[in-house]
């Protein structure tokens, strides 16, 4: 990644300014290192794109808690 | 296939108006944001507009803000560029393109349609 | 608006060289940098997303880095089917805007 040079850790310095279809999302991250500037959270689409958002946002929230629950089901 | 597919150019004389149209398939379009992009004949490429996914949100460039209005119906799956008081300076093949959002950004272009050239001339 | 100078406009080279390509930013766009292909009467093509991050499908002779005001594409080994016109495209901040373009010739 281009923020994760020479450091295990990719920051986010700026978040997205769109909601994300949940449709499009297969899974996410947190990132809380203190080598970032700022808490985020980090989606992957399902075309493996990451975008960074912002953790105090109640869609990012709401996705978040969609991811887990895909996750906790188990598929038939 | 994943496709977007263009219509409604042509030749328009100044101060007309001209309806473009963009038919996606292949892809879930109310998933995407979708954008305008133009290229005026041996130049390079300029943004216009792009709207949201249930069409509520809408950005343009300052020089077609007020003549130029961006609107999409997702059970058609298709995006439309509505063109008034065109000018000379507007002649240029004119593109759809889904519209994704980057790790540090939104609004880079992923899948483009082939283009329709619209001529503004008297 | 932020302003994107590319730089060469032009350039002439040959097939199995190293061509690098730069885009200058007037402001700062962090990573939010896209680049293009574009030949006669097509579509531009996404080549590169975030600055360096590779388009699926792209051949790997392609590369992406920067960040700041100072980016580059390098294709580092030039093939017959790349001669074409790149852009870079930053989607920091609205407008979205594009480079002028630098056209890639067989010399």
């Known amino acids: 990644q281009p923020d994760a040079i020479n450091a295990p850790v990719t920051c986010c310095y700026n978040f997205t300014n769109r909601k994300i279809s949940v449709q499009r999302l297969a899974s996410y991250r947190r990132i809380t290192s203190s080598k970032c500037p700022k808490e985020a959270v980090i989606f992957k689409t399902i075309v493996a794109k990451e975008i960074c958002a912002d953790p105090k946002q109640k869609w990012v929230q709401d996705s978040m808690d969609h991811l887990d629950k895909q996750t906790q089901t188990p598929k038939t | 296939e994943v496709q977007l597919v263009q219509s409604g150019g042509g030749l328009v004389q100044p101060g007309g108006s001209l309806r473009l149209s963009c038919a996606a398939s292949?892809?879930?379009?109310?998933?995407?944001?979708m954008s305008w992009v133009r290229q005026a004949p041996g130049k390079g490429l300029e943004w216009l507009a792009n709207i949201e996914q249930d069409g509520s949100e809408k950005y343009y460039v300052d020089s077609v803000k007020g003549r130029f209005t961006i609107s999409r119906d997702n059970a058609k799956n298709s995006l439309y560029l509505q063109m008034n008081s065109l000018r000379a300076e507007d002649t240029a093949v004119y593109f759809c393109?889904?519209?994704?959002?980057?790790?540090?950004?939104?609004?880079?272009?992923?899948?483009w349609g082939r283009g329709t050239l619209v001529t503004v001339s008297s | 608006a932020i302003q994107l100078t590319q730089s060469p406009s032009s350039l002439s080279a040959s097939v199995g060289d190293r061509v690098i390509l730069t885009c200058r930013a007037s402001?700062?766009?962090?990573?939010?940098l896209a680049w293009y292909q574009q030949k006669p009467g097509k579509a531009p093509k996404l080549l590169i997303y975030d600055a360096s991050s590779l388009e699926s499908g792209v051949p790997s002779r392609f590369s992406g880095s920067g960040s700041g005001p100072d980016f580059t594409l390098t294709i580092s080994s030039l093939q017959p089917e790349d001669f074409a016109t790149y852009f870079c495209?930053?989607?920091?901040?609205?407008?979205?805007?594009f480079g002028g373009g630098t056209k890639v010739e067989i010399k």
């Open positions: 292949g892809f879930t379009f109310s998933h995407y944001w």
């Open positions: 402001q700062g766009v962090s990573s939010a």
């Open positions: 495209q930053q989607f920091n901040s609205y407008p979205l805007t």
């Open positions: 393109a889904r519209d994704l959002e980057g790790l540090h950004g939104d609004g880079y272009f992923d899948l």
